[in-house]
């Protein structure tokens, strides 16, 4: 019998500088790229290795993004949501959701569309 | 981290097939870009074939573009690459690669198009 997986979500402010290319990682999401089912929410896909994401240490591959210098991201198309970090400026302020993985019982299972890593 | 691991390889006379596969596990293989590269004897590692994340988008390496096929089946967390019309050139170790898929939030380049973050041990192909 499989244990149960609870998550456990928490949310941070992190300000990152904007280095020599750039913020660092990549997302995926969108109202027209729906990454997790019945979610058009922004997700961070990749850190890049020695970029300012990966090198402040924050971030974290699965997050979600909620908001970008104060600037919400629902209902966003990808490529919008792509224009806005492009545009963010030098000081980038994101609002981010970790989501992490908390097993009870013997034996874990990742759910379909669950965007941890 | 993802980990990557790789099967299919062997020993094949030329013209033969050969189908590779890669299972991944770690993170969701739907959000992970996959490629597979290959360093042969005496040479640097090169990229042979990517997919992208969505799936609708592949790369091929000149010399095996009619010949060789990338797949991924995300039900089953893997990436394959069918090889066909084999020859002896094409003899080399065969490694997948996984990164991140998605939109840079940075401007675009080509600098890092084959850039990979996680890395299987690889599996010999050899071409008699």
């Known amino acids: 019998m499989n244990g149960r997986v609870d998550y456990l979500v928490t949310e941070e402010e992190i300000n990152l500088t904007r280095g020599p290319s750039g913020l660092g990682f990549n997302i995926v999401g969108g109202t027209d790229q729906q990454y997790v089912s019945n979610d058009s929410g922004i997700y961070v896909s990749r850190i890049k290795e020695n970029g300012a994401a990966a090198l402040d240490g924050r971030l974290q591959e699965g997050d979600k993004i909620l908001s970008v210098n104060g600037q919400d991201l629902k209902n966003l198309l990808h490529q919008d949501a792509v224009d806005l970090f492009r545009n963010a400026g030098y000081a980038v302020s994101l609002r981010v959701q970790h989501r992490l993985q908390v097993q009870n019982g013997p034996i874990g299972h990742r759910g379909e569309g669950d965007p941890s890593g | 981290h993802v980990q990557l691991v790789e099967s299919g390889g062997g020993l094949v006379q030329a013209g033969g097939s050969l189908r590779l596969s890669c299972a991944a596990s770690g993170r969701p293989f739907s959000s992970l870009d996959m490629g597979w590269f290959r360093q042969r004897p005496g040479k640097e590692r090169d990229v042979v074939a990517t997919?992208?994340?969505?799936?609708?988008?592949?790369y091929y390496l000149d010399s095996v573009k009619g010949r060789f096929t990338i797949s991924r089946d995300n039900a089953k967390n893997t990436v394959f690459l069918q090889m066909n019309s084999l020859k002896p050139e094409d003899t080399a170790v065969y490694y997948c690669?996984?990164?991140?898929?998605?939109?840079?939030?940075?401007?675009?380049?080509?600098?890092?198009?084959?850039?990979?973050?996680?890395w299987g041990q690889g599996t010999q192909v050899t071409v008699s």
């Open positions: 690669a996984a990164r991140g898929g998605g939109s840079s939030v940075d401007s675009e380049y080509d600098v890092g198009k084959f850039e990979y973050d996680y």
């Open positions: 997919i992208n994340w969505t799936g609708d988008s592949t």
